[in-house]
Each structure stands twice: as structure tokens, then as C-alpha cells.
Interface confidence: low
């Protein structure tokens, strides 16, 4: 396990003192109830804070809101409640805070029961001004904002209206009726699906889903027998009803949903389900859920086109639709992810992946750690994560699993060693390689961040009592700490750092508690002073990720290509600084044919890296194509894995064939598309 | 333990129909494609075609197009195979066989074949006028 | 559809002797083949899938070989309960098709 604070430890000097001048307290003048936090803007330093108590009469329930501002990260508080006129806010919408740094932030109010719509407050100058609006219909989701202009809003009506705002929630019109589900798309493009019938409900697997691409002057039909949509990177996803049964399958668009392929992946029945685990512009990860209530599925990876898929992970665990699954993307590693499966005798069991998907493995066991009870063999088991199933199983488990992109290699997270996930209190590991080697960071359940891009981690003991002291390493959790910022324990809430990972900044959260009152707490403490000077280059060494055989040419190369990080000495006690850009050297490697997938119409065979050709059917599932409906497909049975940047090497051509008698979609024949007008 | 118990044996006359079942225990019926084989009186095995659990779907072997029909009730984890249109010929021992191809596939660029892994005991079709 | 050839019709063996039975396709099927034993008034047991490997509770003697269109299963060395007709079964393309069997008897 990690050193503790001993003579192999570099302490920080006179870091009380220094820690003390920067430890910053606001009491807020408030009951407990609940507390809500958000950042306004990127390195801005502005903080909403909005505090709310419900006070339930005998008819009805009185509720009341306070609204804090912060522009110094936190250390300082002002109470803007005026600013919205004492109104109470709806919680459950939480604060709509604005793309990239409009700097607008969207509250919505409670209103009567008898009003004819509800009410929202706006600004556009991170929350230093707000101006009230009444709707014309009464909100029954939070308001979105377009990804490209943050002055178009849409929201739901509770009456399943579409409405959208041009001028940032001035004015509203109403779109549609009958929607259902309504997302931004690139381009200010509108998706949605609408209902001919009864209810969203009732019209499951026979909704439309319509585009607008004008802010609702017209209209495009885009889809038929549609059970939901969604939008994950550059693809569109349609899980569409079979004609003939009660199956439904997913469809993939890339432009918009003009044309449609047919996903290559099984299709679900009704008590089963599809789910996009992570997608950017290159490919997709889909859960598609086993038949009956298993608690598991299958994840699929995509090709380039979002249409052939490859088995990636068998019994995946997922709860349930909606539920639970532990699938994290590490950030801190290109092609790393980390999830959980289901094992045949029900224990469950951590797997990763360095190669997007390709090939999962256990985690390797930290160096001098026990394998605890669940091992069979007491020298050979792996470590396991605890992520959100444990969480949601109420396990000893405050945190998941934590990685930031510009922390390179720096990963986070509870676990326990065995050969299976243990309901004993975890331990706290680290990786500072991205997954490939752990070590016991620290002794049971804790809270933790990262601040200053991995200059600094900090923690603070998960316990029941209150507590006083924070626990900080400046060497990626080899050595650590203790801090001691306040005389009065408080009851902890939560840990705040500013999204990215690039603060110096911490807030604690919590609340007091006397005879008669309960108040809101935070304690703000700064770090700049602990990492006294500005990194320089001899700061910094080269490290090679992915790097597993240091001997062979190809050592690093994941995805057809390898990365060399300039990353922070451990012993440098230095600022990264706020302007701290992640320096990598890519190189490019030579094609083997694991850069490849096989194209539809072909597979490849058990232990095998050829692509050779595949039965005529379609993907797994059971319309075999024995019979089936021409399509022209001309491939050489090769595609290159989506994001890979190989070159020269093995280049796998063959001759182009011409695949007939695949299976194609038959989801929406051009004869049904139609346009409409507003 | 897996099993697959089919119906008993049946003696139909020429243009009758007659239809089998198969009821599958100690695995989840949903999981597993089931496959319909039949064995005339010292002759080989034939694939008659296949049925999908969760949705239903099928596909049968070209010969039998028309003449059969495979159905499958999920309550009772049971699935049937009817041939209409009787002739002498179709006399032979007609098995239900567990098929895991579809469960085994994982889309073109993985398909591997488990083979049928479980079958039931047989069911004796004669048809005689 | 894809014609499966067995070969031979029928084999002669003693017991303690290896056996080699033979299947070939008409066209390639990769390795989506799977092997059966069936003894007389029995339904048919899967022996080998994915052509090489073995089902489960299948004994070590059995091993099957081949990819594409030329297939082997051989028995290392008979036991009198090895004495059935052997299936071979290709499922790259609908329909399944299975050989005309191979019967290993005693010699």
C-alpha cells in the first residue's frame, strides 16, 4: 500500500499556516433543507448556490428559496434572493445553466395551481441580473438550450406541447402537440416524437419522429413505429417496431435521419432494452439487453458507420431500463473504459479495456495487497471497482470512480481485492497509468477530487459523525496530509471543485447542528499557496502510455497509434497552473490486422484475426436472409476500427465482392417520408 | 437440468396435420433459438427450420415452405411445430433441438456456431392411409 | 443450399483403434460445423462445435479439425460405446444442413 506519512514522504512545510490564510467560511443565513450548486462558466469563478425548505402545512406544502452568488470560486457569498423576487424555486428543475460561457442561467418557479402558466427567471450576465418571465404554458421539463445558440430554448409542456424560444425564454411559441420526447441536434436541428392516439404511453412503439431543422416552420417525418430515439456523437439512433411481432430493433442515421441503416445488432423484445454506454464522433458502445430479468446483456461496438457491431463483453451488468451499470469511461486514457459483469454464480466482477472495446481483462491485483475472502486462491485474484451498482445497493460507497483528461493517467476509485466485487467497506485505490497498475491510495470509504490538473488530491473520510479534517497529497496519492480547517466539526454534504479539474480551489459542504437550528456550511480552502511556484520543464518527464513491453517496436500502440505525455514528476511540489495544456507527442504505427473489424457479411472465426465470409444473415437475429430482399453491398471484408490511425503494415485487401441478399431496413420506405409545413 | 420434453407419438392419415410441442425447463426459455430436425425410418437427419422465442420470428427450410409452422407460447415455455398436408413420406421421428446460433452470433464480425446442445426425446409422426 | 458429404458411408473398426471420419461442404462454411453422435432409437448428441471444440461432458478421445470446406472427426481410440452413426451439420447458411451420417461399426 501507499507509504504513509513517514520518512519516505516528502511533507509540505509550514502547509498549516499557509492552508489557514486560505481557508475561507460562509454561514448561510438558512434552515438546512436541501442545497444545489452549480458553476456558471469556465474559470469564471461564479457559483449558484440555491437553498430551498419545504415547510409542509396541513393543506399544503409552503416552500421557500435563497439564492447565493459567489465570483472568487466560493470563499465569499452574497444573498441575491431579491434578485428573484423571493420567489421558490422548483428544485426538480434544478438551475439551467448555459453552454460554454454564455453565462446564462435559466431558474424556474413555482407557480399556484390556478395560474395559467409558469414562471421562470432569466439572466445573461452570470447570474448578476435576472429578469422574470411568465409562460405561456406550464414547464414539465428543465429548458434546454441549443448547443449552437444559447439563445433558442425548447421545453415539454405539461400538456405534451413542443414549445421554443428565439430570444432566450422572452417569447415562446408553441411547435407541436403530442410530443413525447424532444432533443437538440447539431445545427439547432429539433428532434422529436409525437403520438397519433392516446398518450405517449399508449402509443409506445408506434410514435413518429419528426425533425425540424427551422425552429418549427416545417417539418420532416423521419421515422414510423418509433419506441424512442436518441443521439449519441454523430450518430442518430430509432429503436423501431418489427412489423410482425412484438420486437423492436435499432435503426442508425448519419445525416440527420434522411436515410436509415439497419444496426446489425439482435433485436429486443418488450421487457428488454437498448442503451447508447458512450458514443462520440468515431463510434458507439450499446448495451442491448438479455431476454428476461437477468440483470445483464451484451455491449456491442460500433464500426465507423454505427451499422456493424462487434461482440465486445458478455453478461454485462445492468440493472434494469434506467438502472444500474457501472460502465465508466476513464478520461484520463484514450481507450480505456472499466465496467462490471455478472458472473455465472451471480458475483459480480470488474473487467477494463485499453483497446476501445476490443478486449476486456480483470484488473491487475495492487502490489502488496491480500486477496480478502471472496478468492478462491489467496495469491492470484484482481481488483474490483465499485461504481454506480454499489452505490445504488446502499453499499459503503460515497464515491465512483474519478479521472479527468488533463490528470493523464490518473484513476480513482473504491475497490476491493478478491476475485469478486466484496460487500466489505472498500478501500481507496489509484492508478496513475490508466488502469493498467493499482495501489491502496487509502484505509476505507472516502470523498475525493482532483485539483490543479493532478497537482493535488484531495480527501475526506467517509464517516457518520461530524468531522473537521481534510486529508491532501501533492504526489498522486502516494503520501498524504491532514488538515485540520475548522474547530467545530461540521456534518459533511459534499466536496466542490470547479468542472475540469484545473481549480486550486475546494469547498467543503455541510451543516451545523445546535439545540434549535441546523445552517449551511462551507468552508473554501485555496491550495495556491501549498504549490508555491510555477512548474517548469525539468518538472516534467516523459512517460509513454499504454506501454506494457518497453522492448518491442510496437509497445504503446493502441488504435494505431501511440502517445508519448510530458506528465508531472511526483516529487514536484508545483503549480500546473489554470492555463495547463496536456502535452502528447502522437506517432503513428504499422496496420496489423487488430486494426481492423470485419465488415458486414463477414466475421472472425474463434482465435483468429482473419475476416472471413459471413452467412447471409442478418447480424444474430432470426430473419435469416435465407430468402430475403436483394441489397447491392460491395466490401473487402475489412473496415478500419473506428479512430484508428494506423499506416502501411498489413493492408488487407481483397477483391471487392458483391454481398446480395442482406437484409436491409425496411423502417422507412422513401413512399412514407414526407415534409410538412407549420 | 436442461430439458426438452416433446409431445407423444401421433398416426395421421394422408392430408391431415399434425403438430408437435416441445417444452423447454431449466433454462431461460427466451435465451435459446429452437430448431425443428426430423429423421425418416432409417435415413438421416433433416432441418426443418428454426423459431425465435422472444419475438416469435422464423425460418424454414425451403422444402417445408408452406407446409409448416412454427409457434412458440412463452407462458409455458413451450414451442410447436405443425406440418399440414400429410403425406406417406413425412413418416419419421420429428426432435425439437436447442439451438444457441442466435445467442452465439454477435453480429458479422464475431458469428461462431455453438451447435444443438440439447434435444428432446423424439416424437414418432406416422402417416398412413 | 449447402451440400454436406460424408465420407465414408460406413467405417469398420476395432475396438482401441483411432477412426477418422471426413465431412466436406460444397462450399466454404468457415468453421460452423458441429459434429453429432446418435446410437440406435436415441436422439442425436452434439459432440463438437465451431468444428474443434469439444460440448460439454464430451470425453478428450474426440477431436474434430478442419475450416472451410474439409472437415475430420476422429475418435483416438474406440470404446464399445463409441459404435453410432456420426452427423456433421453446417450452419453458415440457412438452411442447416446435415451429411448423410457415417456408421462406425465393430470390425
Known amino acids: 500500500s501507499a507509504p504513509g506519512e513517514d520518512e519516505e514522504c516528502g511533507r509540505v512545510r509550514d502547509f498549516v499556516a499557509k492552508l489557514a490564510n486560505n481557508t475561507h467560511q460562509h454561514v448561510f443565513d438558512d434552515l438546512r433543507g436541501s442545497v444545489s450548486l452549480s458553476w456558471v462558466g469556465d474559470s469564471t469563478g461564479v457559483i449558484l448556490v440555491l437553498t430551498t425548505f419545504h415547510v409542509p402545512l396541513v393543506i399544503m406544502t409552503f416552500g421557500q428559496s435563497k439564492l447565493y452568488r459567489s465570483e472568487d470560486y466560493g470563499k465569499n457569498f452574497k444573498d441575491i434572493t431579491d434578485l428573484i423576487n423571493n420567489t421558490f424555486i422548483r428544485t426538480e428543475f434544478g438551475m439551467a445553466i448555459g453552454p460554454e460561457n454564455s453565462g446564462k442561467v435559466v431558474l424556474t418557479a413555482e407557480v399556484s395551481g390556478g395560474s395559467r402558466g409558469g414562471r421562470i427567471f432569466r439572466s445573461s450576465d452570470f447570474a448578476k441580473n435576472f429578469v422574470q418571465t411568465d409562460l405561456p404554458f406550464h414547464p414539465l421539463t428543465q429548458m434546454m438550450y441549443s448547443p449552437q445558440n444559447s439563445d433558442y430554448l425548447l421545453a415539454l409542456s405539461t400538456e405534451n406541447g413542443l414549445w421554443v424560444s428565439k430570444n432566450f425564454g422572452g417569447k415562446w411559441e408553441e411547435i407541436h402537440k403530442a410530443v413525447c420526447l424532444a432533443k437538440w441536434g447539431s445545427d439547432n436541428t429539433i428532434f422529436f416524437t409525437t403520438y397519433a392516439n392516446g398518450s405517449c404511453k399508449a402509443d409506445l412503439g408506434a410514435l413518429e419522429l419528426w425533425r425540424t431543422s427551422d425552429l418549427g416552420k416545417s417539418f420532416k417525418t423521419i421515422g414510423v413505429k418509433i419506441y424512442s430515439f436518441g443521439l449519441g456523437g454523430r450518430f442518430l439512433f430509432a429503436s423501431v417496431m418489427a412489423d410482425k411481432d412484438t420486437t423492436r430493433r435499432i435503426h442508425v442515421s448519419t445525416d440527420q435521419g434522411d436515410t436509415w441503416s439497419m444496426a446489425q445488432l439482435p433485436s429486443v423484445g418488450q421487457e428488454q432494452f437498448y442503451s447508447i454506454l458512450a458514443a462520440n464522433d468515431d463510434m458507439v458502445f450499446m448495451h442491448v439487453d438479455e431476454p428476461g430479468d437477468t440483470g445483464f446483456g451484451t455491449i456491442f461496438t460500433s464500426d465507423d458507420r454505427g451499422i456493424v457491431y462487434s461482440k465486445s463483453l458478455d453478461r454485462h451488468l445492468y440493472t434494469t431500463t434506467g438502472g444500474e451499470t457501472d460502465f465508466t469511461n476513464v478520461t484520463s486514457l484514450r481507450g480505456v473504459y472499466i465496467t462490471s459483469v455478472l458472473s455465472e454464480d451471480n458475483s459480480i466482477q470488474t473487467m477494463i479495456t485499453f483497446d476501445q472495446g476490443g478486449r476486456w481483462t480483470h484488473l491487475r491485483k495492487p502490489e502488496n495487497s491480500e486477496c480478502d475472502a471472496t478468492a478462491k486462491n489467496k495469491n492470484e485474484c484482481s481488483l474490483h471497482i465499485h461504481a454506480s451498482y454499489s452505490i445504488s445497493q446502499k453499499l459503503n460507497v460515497p464515491m465512483a470512480p474519478l479521472s479527468e483528461p488533463n490528470a493523464v493517467g490518473i484513476v480513482i476509485a473504491h475497490g476491493s481485492v478478491g476475485d469478486a466485487i466484496s460487500v466489505m467497506v472498500p478501500d481507496v485505490y489509484i492508478s496513475d497509468d490508466g488502469g493498467y497498475s493499482w495501489t491502496k491510495m487509502l484505509e476505507g470509504p472516502h470523498y475525493y477530487t482532483i485539483l490543479d490538473s493532478g497537482g493535488i488530491i484531495v480527501a475526506i473520510e467517509h464517516s457518520s459523525r461530524p468531522i473537521n479534517v481534510i486529508k491532501f497529497s501533492t504526489d498522486e496519492g502516494q503520501c498524504w496530509q491532514t488538515y485540520t480547517f475548522t474547530r467545530d466539526p461540521i456534518y459533511f454534504t459534499g466536496l466542490a471543485s470547479e468542472p475540469g479539474a484545473r481549480s486550486m480551489n475546494i469547498s467543503i459542504w455541510g451543516f451545523t447542528e445546535s439545540f434549535l437550528t441546523a445552517q449551511w456550511v462551507s468552508y473554501t480552502i485555496d491550495f495556491k499557496d501549498i504549490l508555491e511556484r510555477n512548474c517548469e520543464e525539468k518538472d516534467y518527464t516523459i512517460w509513454l502510455a499504454h506501454s506494457t513491453d518497453p522492448e518491442d517496436y510496437e509497445d504503446g500502440c493502441i488504435l494505431g497509434y501511440k502517445e508519448q505525455f510530458l506528465r508531472l514528476r511526483k516529487s514536484s511540489v508545483c503549480q500546473n497552473g489554470r492555463d495547463y495544456v496536456v502535452t502528447k507527442q502522437p506517432s503513428i504505427c504499422l496496420c496489423s490486422l487488430e486494426d481492423f473489424l470485419c465488415d458486414f457479411g463477414y466475421y472472425r472465426p474463434e482465435n483468429d484475426s482473419k475476416c472471413v465470409e459471413q452467412p447471409e444473415l442478418k447480424g444474430h437475429d432470426l430473419e435469416f436472409c435465407l430468402y430475403g430482399r436483394e441489397e447491392h453491398l460491395t466490401t473487402n471484408g475489412y473496415r478500419k476500427i473506428p479512430g484508428d490511425k494506423c499506416q502501411g503494415g498489413v493492408n488487407p485487401v481483397r477483391e471487392v465482392k458483391d454481398l446480395k441478399k442482406k437484409c436491409t431496413s425496411n423502417f422507412l420506405s422513401p413512399e412514407k417520408q414526407n415534409s410538412k409545413s407549420n | 437440468q436442461v430439458q426438452l420434453v416433446q409431445s407423444g407419438a401421433e398416426v395421421k392419415k394422408p392430408g391431415a396435420s399434425v403438430k408437435v410441442s416441445c417444452k423447454a425447463s431449466?433454462?431461460?426459455?427466451?435465451?435459446?433459438?429452437m430448431s425443428w430436425v426430423r429423421q425418416a425410418p432409417g435415413q438421416g437427419l433433416e432441418w426443418m427450420g428454426i423459431i425465435n422465442p422472444v419475438g416469435g420470428s422464423t425460418s424454414y427450410a425451403q422444402k417445408f415452405q408452406g407446409r409448416v409452422t412454427m409457434t412458440r407460447d412463452t407462458s409455458t415455455s413451450t414451442v410447436y411445430m405443425e406440418l399440414s398436408s400429410l403425406r406417406s413420406e413425412d413418416t419419421a421421428v420429428y426432435y425439437c433441438a436447442r439451438d444457441p446460433s442466435g445467442i452465439a452470433a454477435a453480429g458479422p464480425a464475431s458469428r461462431y456456431y455453438y451447435g444443438m446442445d440439447v434435444w428432446g426425446q423424439g416424437t414418432t409422426v406416422t402417416v398412413s392411409s | 443450399e449447402i451440400v454436406m458429404t460424408q465420407s465414408p458411408a460406413t467405417l469398420s473398426v476395432s475396438p482401441g483403434e483411432r477412426a477418422t471420419l471426413s465431412c466436406r461442404a460444397s462450399q466454404s462454411v468457415s468453421s460452423n460445423l458441429a459434429w453429432y453422435q446418435q446410437k440406435p432409437g436415441q436422439a442425436p448428441r452434439l459432440l463438437i462445435y465451431g468444428a474443434s471444440t469439444r460440448a460439454t461432458g464430451i470425453p478428450a478421445r474426440f477431436s474434430g479439425s478442419g475450416s472451410g470446406t474439409e472437415f475430420t472427426l476422429t475418435i483416438s481410440s474406440l470404446q464399445s460405446e463409441d459404435f453410432a452413426v456420426y452427423y456433421c451439420?453446417?450452419?453458415?447458411?440457412?438452411?442447416?444442413?446435415f451429411g448423410g451420417g457415417t456408421k462406425v461399426e465393430i470390425k
Open positions: 451439420q453446417q450452419a453458415r447458411l440457412g438452411p442447416w444442413t
Open positions: 431449466g433454462y431461460t426459455f427466451t435465451s435459446r433459438y
